[in-house]
């Protein structure tokens, strides 16, 4: 099934001119992010029923090993060079999720809704910071790693990688809202 | 006709490999699908061996009891699975089934008439 | 590790008896067990799956209930070809030392 965020190397053929208040804009999203990253982590763990909700330390941690870095401290392009890489590996690991819980807990409507709702503030924040990366920086390319393929896991495995990388997004967002 | 069919078991001695195979018919090995190896000693209950996604990651799923002995894998381009079983025991003989499951793979829906291992 | 305990390991029972197997989980597995039927020399066949859908073409008599750690399965009467054994298993964790299956309940005629 196709993932919510499935970019290509990006070109800066930008099809539209960029929206005035580029970095407003963004800022504007990561905020409305860390806003509701709370409430989606705790709608995803109650919705896993046990183990999760008194696990969560162990189950729901964000030790998400390979996870793209980010260094709040870095220029404006750098960190929009990172917040790129972070935002395409949220994405596909956000469709991983959606994908799962659409098996798993196909009743857990709000949950799908919430997490629908996250992915398409995802893809509008990575066309945002690709317009602002390419008319300001000519940044017309940027490697990037996607979020772990869910598919061959076990039940337990699917919930638990799911719990784990929403802690990481709970706790990235905060920090990248503040950053920009 | 959606069928899943054993072959390659037989008499070995302790120590010797076996590989059994489960042709799948019916249905194709390249959607989200799981196939595993279920056994059953003589007069004893199930026991599960290993699962296989045979989507594009492959991840396999392995008992304590086998784990390192044997290997599963699949060829998706002849819709087959197999088993691969070294370093083989008396307590492995038993009749091995091959089973299938949709993803999530939380129950097996798809068995195969078993082929019986003997180790001897 | 989940551990799989299913009682009784086997029973008599007569024609039209309502009989109920009980499968307990060492830990949670949520709703993710599963219920099936094996008659001697054949292989197993899914009766319930996720704790109480019924499986396609299974008699309605064949009902499944429990989540968490505690489930059950009933048959409501009897029949002469419902004489086989029953094998619950948990769909839950595949880990190497999970164990799947229960040990099974051998249902004898009376």
């Known amino acids: 099934s196709p993932l919510p965020i499935t970019p290509v190397n990006a070109t800066c053929a930008i099809r539209h001119p960029c929206h005035n208040n580029l970095m407003n804009q963004i800022r504007s999203q990561l905020a409305q992010l860390n806003g509701s990253a709370n409430a989606l982590f705790i709608l995803y763990y109650t919705a896993q029923g046990e183990p999760f909700p008194n696990n969560l330390d162990k189950l729901c941690g964000p030790n998400v090993t390979d996870f793209p870095p980010f260094h709040a401290n870095g220029t404006e392009k750098a960190k929009l060079v990172e917040l790129y890489r972070i935002v395409v590996y949220l994405g596909t690991s956000l469709g991983n999720i959606t994908r799962d819980q659409k098996i798993l807990n196909p009743s857990a409507l709000s949950l799908h809704s919430k997490l629908n709702a996250t992915a398409d503030i995802l893809r509008g924040l990575l066309s945002n910071v690709l317009c602002r990366l390419c008319s300001k920086y000519h940044v017309g390319h940027v490697d990037v790693t996607y979020g772990p393929d869910t598919s061959g896991k076990d039940v337990f495995q699917k919930k638990k990688l799911g719990c784990q990388l929403l802690g990481k997004y709970k706790q990235i967002i905060a920090v990248l809202a503040q950053a920009f | 006709e959606v069928q899943l069919v054993e072959s390659g078991g037989g008499l070995v001695q302790p120590g010797g490999s076996l590989r059994l195979s489960c042709a799948a018919s019916g249905f194709s090995f390249s959607t989200d699908y799981w196939m595993s190896w279920v056994r059953q000693a003589p007069g004893k209950g199930l026991e599960w061996v290993s699962s296989i996604y045979v989507g594009t990651s492959g991840d396999t799923y392995y008992a304590d009891s086998v784990k390192g002995r044997f290997t599963i894998s699949r060829d998706n381009s002849k819709n087959t699975l197999y088993l691969q079983m070294d370093s083989l025991r008396a307590e492995d003989t038993a009749i091995y089934y091959c089973a299938g499951a949709d993803n999530p793979y939380d129950y097996f829906n798809l068995w195969g008439q078993g082929t019986l291992v003997t180790v001897s | 590790d989940i551990q799989m305990t299913q009682s009784p390991s086997s029973l008599s029972a007569s024609v039209g008896d309502r009989v109920t197997i009980t499968c307990r989980a060492s830990?949670?597995?949520?709703?993710?067990l599963n219920w099936y039927q094996q008659k001697p020399g054949k292989a197993p066949k899914l009766l319930i799956y996720r704790a109480s859908s019924l499986q396609s073409g299974v008699p309605s008599r064949f009902s499944g209930s429990g989540s968490g750690t505690d489930f059950t399965l009933t048959i409501s009467s009897l029949q002469p070809e419902d004489f086989a054994t029953y094998y619950c298993?948990?769909?839950?964790?595949?880990?190497?030392?999970?164990?799947?299956f229960g040990g099974g309940t051998k249902v004898e005629i009376k």
């Open positions: 830990e949670t597995i949520s709703g993710y």
């Open positions: 298993q948990q769909g839950y964790s595949y880990s190497d030392t999970d164990n799947v």
